[in-house]
């Protein structure tokens, strides 16, 4: 839930004046309060559908619910990306789309969601218990991933509930990222307010030292928060994952995108190609992973942990974004 709070204009403290409850300390709680209240929790949703017309064909749909801009989407199967999963498609908002068999068609649906159709025949075709994962690299939230699968008993005529145990991941790097800062900020805010309640307002005194707080503290969440958020992967082995696709991971540098046509996902298609009726999406999962983009050795084809961002090719974003979360 996102609400808005008004923040007083930030004014520099008067020269030479700073105290325990000086300008800086009075303004900081308001800033932190605003951050705490307005920070929506990022989330990734996943749907896996079996096409009714081609029973061995799947459509994977997934999207990112967050306030940042998406810089890369990776769809994998056989487990999460970087944990035994095999990349099926990589979608970049500017540099286009790259996909590997059995992926037939990867497309952007909105600026925060994608779909991927998998071929239904051949040695590398998926089976019902295959796990499909979507990983969204976003700034400033970092990397978020969720997984879903069809239960083995999938029948186009029937509709079963989604698999009960989602694959969850919480990378320590992400906890130390934006979420950590916000968590610390909220705790610090409570601490300030509590301290303020038990202490008379002091007089302003001349400043002897720089009023900057040490930065390292902001990146150190409590052990309790780490314990609460660190959920290991529940790895699912599947006989359907072809070993031959393991070499398809995009480990190349920026030149890897050179052959990709911009807006490869935006060629309009007639209704016929998309007319099959999917049966229910099975498996729609909430993600808890928030890694800062990607772990070493499995970075998207740009350097730096979320610092080198690509411009969005879809033109300037609308003033308000999707559902008010942009």
């Amino acid at each position: 839930m996102r609400t808005e709070a008004q923040v007083p204009a930030l004014q520099p403290p008067e020269p030479g004046l700073e105290g325990a409850m000086g300008h800086r300390t009075l303004v900081l709680p308001w800033v932190l309060l605003t951050l705490c209240v307005t920070a929506g929790t990022p989330e990734v949703w996943v749907q896996v559908r079996m096409e009714a017309t081609e029973l061995s064909s799947f459509t994977i749909r997934c999207g990112f619910l967050g306030s940042g801009s998406i810089s890369l989407v990776t769809v994998s199967w056989g487990g999460p990306n970087g944990a035994g999963g095999t990349t099926l498609a990589v979608l970049h908002p500017e540099r286009g789309i790259r996909q590997w068999a059995p992926a037939r068609q990867a497309r952007w649906e909105t600026q925060s969601s994608i779909s991927l159709i998998l071929e239904g025949s051949g040695a590398s075709s998926p089976c019902a218990n295959t796990t499909f994962c979507c990983k969204f690299a976003s700034f400033p939230e970092g990397s978020w991933e969720a997984c879903g699968s069809l239960p083995p008993s999938s029948d186009p005529g029937l509709s079963a509930p989604p698999t009960p145990a989602p694959i969850l991941r919480a990378d320590l790097a992400g906890i130390l990222g934006v979420s950590g800062v916000l968590l610390f900020g909220c705790v610090y805010l409570l601490h300030l307010l509590r301290r303020h309640k038990h202490r008379p307002a002091p007089r302003l005194q001349p400043s002897r030292t720089s009023p900057q707080a040490p930065r390292a503290r902001a990146w150190a969440p409590s052990q309790a928060s780490q314990a609460a958020l660190h959920v290991p992967y529940a790895t699912i082995n599947t006989s359907c994952r072809p070993a031959t696709l393991d070499t398809a991971h995009p480990h190349g540098g920026p030149s890897w995108w050179a052959s990709l046509p911009t807006h490869a996902a935006h060629r309009p298609q007639g209704p016929a190609a998309w007319a099959s009726t999917p049966i229910p999406a099975r498996g729609s999962f909430v993600s808890v992973e928030n890694g800062l983009y990607a772990q070493a050795g499995e970075r998207p084809p740009h350097t730096g942990p979320g610092l080198t961002l690509f411009p969005d090719p879809r033109g300037p974003r609308a003033m308000e974004g999707p559902l008010g979360v942009r």
């Epitope: 839930m1 989330e43 949703w45 749907q47 559908r49 749909r61 997934c62 999207g63 619910l65 068609q105 497309r107 952007w108 649906e109 909105t110 600026q111 925060s112 969601s113 994608i114 779909s115 509709s159 509930p161 989604p162 807006h263 996902a265 935006h266 060629r267 309009p268 298609q269 209704p271 190609a273 998309w274 009726t277 999917p278 049966i279 229910p280 999406a281 498996g283 729609s284 909430v286 879809r314 033109g315 974003r317 609308a318 003033m319 974004g321 999707p322 559902l323 008010g324 979360v325």
Partner: antibody
Framework: QVQLKQSGPGLVQPSQNLSITCTVS????????INWVRQSPGKGLEWLGV???????EYNAAFRSRLSISKDTSKSQVFLKMNSLQADDTAIYSC????????????WGPGTSVTVSS | DLQMTQTTSSLSASLGDRVTISCRTS??????LNWYQQKPDGPLKLLIY???RLHSGVPSRFSGSGSGTDYSLTISNLEQEDIATYFC?????????FGGGTKLEIK
């Protein structure tokens, strides 16, 4: 600001075709899906179909044989075409924006009231 | 098609009341549920998406909850401007389907 405007006929003869244009402003069709929904007293709200930013479409199976959704991104227009209308197709037809892929329609057009009658 | 049932078609409440509108689905929809408000002769207005996420600009007195096949929309402190018809809608399987609506009236 975000706006969806609709234009189309109010009266359609039975067995004739329906064409409605949804013209959007305040956002680009390259980043959003556009759904078509109709509402009638007898049948309530019925989802007809969607065209996503990438151009791919999805249709309600009940209408697929006579429904077509297309768009002209450069003109910020989305088109609904429905063939062989009958009296029970009388309804208010609306286009609505989808921002997340969740079929959650955050902005709606005003609706086009369509009466099928001779 | 997946069936959406809003058992209460009409609901009366007093201003300031806490009002809960329910929606039941014919199968598990994994939280892919949205809520809309519609005033007479007006378009639908998105309130809540993905079960509990508040759409921008919607007052915080609106909240959504639920899981599996049972979902609800709650208005914590009913105001005059909330008098309208409320629809639930699933986005879990094609085609997306809507409930029949719950008309909220003042006692």
């Amino acid at each position: 600001q975000v706006q969806l405007k609709q234009s189309g006929p109010g009266l359609v003869q039975p067995s004739q075709n329906l064409s409605i244009t949804c013209t959007v402003s305040g956002f680009s069709l390259t980043g959003y899906g556009i759904n078509w929904v109709r509402q009638s007293p007898g049948k309530g709200l019925e989802w007809l179909g969607v065209i996503w930013s990438g151009g791919n479409t999805e249709y309600n199976a009940a209408f697929r044989s006579r429904l077509s959704i297309s768009k002209d991104t450069s003109k910020s227009q989305v088109f609904l075409k429905m063939n062989s209308l009958q009296a029970d197709d009388t309804a208010i037809y609306s286009c609505a924006r989808d921002s997340t892929g969740l079929y959650a329609m955050d902005y709606w057009g005003p609706g086009t009231s369509v009466t099928v009658s001779s | 098609d997946l069936q959406m049932t809003q058992t209460t078609s009409s609901l009366s409440a007093s201003l300031g009341d806490r009002v809960t509108i329910s929606c039941r689905t014919s199968q598990d929809i994994s939280n892919f549920l949205n809520w809309y408000q519609q005033k007479p002769d007006g378009p639908l207005k998105l309130l809540i998406y993905y079960t509990s996420r508040l759409h921008s600009g919607v007052p915080s007195r609106f909240s959504g909850s639920g899981s599996g096949t049972d979902y609800s929309l709650t208005i914590s402190n009913l105001e005059q401007e909330d008098i309208a018809t409320y629809f639930c809608q699933q986005g879990y399987m094609l085609p997306p389907t809507f409930g029949g609506g719950t008309k909220l009236e003042i006692k």
